[in-house]
């Protein structure tokens, strides 16, 4: 299709080389039409558009994204060529930063319903570059935490080193929806609830004598409880002896509950004690079996292909640890009689 009639928007993504971060592009179709595709209408309920030339389906994924190769080759369908870019409804998610993401991205409705629709497209020229501003050492992170029940704030990473007075007007989105009342470089939350969690996008306009472009940053916000003050506890095994049959396979499960920690580095491992020798066992990876705001239950199994006489004199020890401390539970195998 002819992209010469597409509206054009220029965006800048300045990424930090110190941290992982994501980026998003919204399919910013002309205002009246947008509601039919993406439900990201900026109009108030009282403002009804005069005409709705795009009579597309209300299916939220009803847009198509392309990338325009710089060498003039035909447009490429994003889904087929770029595994690190994911389309979610009307949003394009870039999972990894890098200058190779620079380029022109085009979105348009999938369903062409009227002659007007041909020109219904947006071309986004994205420039991606690493952050070079060393003067702002403590810029806000692209991952921010809000403590439930307390006051908190979400800072726009690209503006966090500027005072509120010198900060330009900022447009904020949460999970793709415009937050029309927020205009500063910081969103203040009086009391944090779990619904404050989500993907926030902050945009501001930067201009020079030639052109203007939108500087965008994405912030993943999670709502958290305070860090635990307790070491993890082992839920299973409970007993310190286990009846087994010699020659049969055996799986012993260790399940432990870890309280929430902002920096979470749980350790769960099995080791064997034989007389005063001990060694860690190569066992399958640990897996999270339940995760809540307050804690996480992690399980790790030890698998014996067949129980031998030697295993009866050994102790199988599950060791769990967080930043507060560690807990162990040992199991001695006992031969089943009869």
């Amino acid at each position: 299709f002819n992209i010469s009639g597409c509206s054009t928007k220029k965006l800048l993504w300045t990424y930090s080389t110190r941290s992982e971060e994501e980026f998003v592009l919204f399919c910013d179709l002309p205002e009246p039409q947008k509601s039919h595709f993406c439900h990201r209408n900026r109009l108030s309920p009282k403002q009804v558009p005069e005409h709705l030339p795009f009579m597309g389906s209300n299916d939220l994924s009803d847009v198509q994204w392309y990338q325009q190769p710089s060498n003039g080759d035909p447009l490429e369908d994003i889904r087929k060529s770029y595994p690190h870019i994911i389309q979610d409804k009307c949003t394009l998610h870039f999972l990894t930063p890098g200058v190779n993401n620079s380029g022109s991205y085009i979105c348009r409705p999938k369903m062409i319903k009227s002659p007007y629709d041909v020109a219904c497209c947006v071309k986004m020229i994205l420039e991606v570059k690493p952050q070079t501003n060393a003067s702002c050492e403590y810029s806000a992170s692209h991952k921010q935490d809000l403590l439930l029940g307390s006051t908190g704030s979400i800072s726009c990473p690209s503006l966090s080193c500027q005072s509120d007075a010198q900060s330009p007007a900022v447009t904020w989105y949460k999970n793709g929806k415009l937050l029309s009342v927020e205009r500063s470089n910081r969103i203040v939350v009086d009391e944090v609830y779990d619904y404050h969690q989500g993907t926030y996008v902050c945009d501001y306009t930067q201009s020079d004598t030639v052109s203007s472009w939108t500087v965008r940053a994405v912030v993943q916000v999670r709502t958290i409880v305070g860090d635990t003050k307790l070491k993890p506890d082992i839920l299973d095994p409970v007993e310190d002896t286990l009846e087994v049959e010699l020659g049969k396979p055996l799986t012993i499960s260790c399940k432990a509950r870890f309280g929430f920690e902002r920096v979470f580095n749980p350790v769960i491992k099995w080791y064997i004690k034989d007389s005063d020798l001990e060694w860690e066992v190569s066992v399958p990876e640990a897996k999270s079996i339940k995760s809540t705001l307050k804690d996480e239950i992690i399980e790790r199994n030890i698998i014996l292909e067949k129980v031998t006489q030697r295993d009866l004199r050994r102790k199988f020890v599950c060791f769990v640890q967080n930043s507060i401390g560690n807990t162990t539970q040992s199991v001695q195998l006992k031969e089943k009689r009869g």
Epitope: S275, D276, L277, W279, Q309, R313
Partner: antibody, heavy 120, light 111 residues
Framework: SLEESGGGLVKPGASLTLTCTAS?????????MCWVRQAPGKGLEWIAC????????AYYASWAKGRFTISKTSSTTVTLQMTSLTAADTATYFC??????????????WGPGTLVTVSS | AIKMTQTPSSVSAAVGGTVTINCRAS??????LAWYQQKPGQPPKLLIY???DLASGVPSRFKGSGSGTEYTLTISGVQCDDAATYYC?????????????FGGGTEVVVK
């Protein structure tokens, strides 16, 4: 592999330190490092073992206690200090690793031995 | 203190025959028992560990059995290469004392 060094000819009453150097692995808590000796034409005689982990617990034959000392001097070397040597201590001294590897399988390794001769 | 008593001190066997060597511990060593083969001028070679488990690369004609204080090494289908001295050893190092004691050895002569 394991290699013993420090053997040779010494006079009765003298002291001697033997060193066992491990290559290809470093010490861990899943095995012991041991010393065993064998007098010419005689059987094997266990002297001592030391736990190769951080505990460093040492275990001795009753006849060796007090006169022989086993020590871990680095993550790859073990020594055997011998004092008040007599002709009866003349033997080939072997260093051995005994216990389990990191997967819990048995691991037994011996050095070639070093000869200690006690004679005036 | 653990004392290991090995019998007989010498045994003669024809090629293809069977040899049985016994080892008695003065106290329960909980199957921490190893059997070694030694040939002149060489360090010992592990045959059996934990009383009955065959060490890696050892032919299946070597068999260890026993528990508590009584242990046995059986060599069936004896071959010329089996001529050597065999030792049992307690590997219960962390027991009271003499946890690593060896038996006196059994010389196997193959005819």
């Amino acid at each position: 592999s394991l290699e013993e060094s420090g053997g040779g000819l010494v006079k009765p009453g003298a002291s001697l330190t033997l060193t066992c150097t491990a290559s290809g692995f470093s010490f861990s808590s899943s095995y012991y490092m041991c010393w065993v000796r064998q007098a010419p034409g005689k059987g094997l005689e266990w002297i001592a073992c030391i736990h190769a982990g951080s505990s460093g617990s040492a275990y001795y034959a009753s006849w060796a206690k007090g006169r022989f000392t086993i020590s871990k001097t680095s993550s790859t070397t073990v020594t055997l200090q011998m004092t008040s040597l007599t002709a009866a201590d003349t033997a080939t001294y072997f260093c051995a690793r005994d216990g389990y590897d990191d997967y819990g399988d048995p691991f037994n390794l011996w050095g070639p031995g070093t000869l200690v001769t006690v004679s005036s | 203190a653990i004392k290991m008593t090995q019998t007989p001190s010498s045994v003669s066997a024809a090629v293809g025959g069977t040899v049985t060597i016994n080892c008695r511990a003065s106290e329960d060593i909980k199957s921490y028992l190893a059997w070694y083969q030694q040939k002149p001028g060489q360090p010992p070679k592990l045959l059996i560990y934990d009383a009955s488990d065959l060490a890696s690369g050892v032919p299946s004609r070597f068999k260890g059995s026993g528990s508590g204080t009584e242990y046995t090494l059986t060599i069936s289908g004896v071959q010329c290469d089996d001529a050597a001295t065999y030792y049992c050893q307690s590997a219960y190092y962390s027991s009271s004392t003499d946890g690593g004691a060896f038996g006196g050895g059994t010389e196997v002569v193959v005819k």
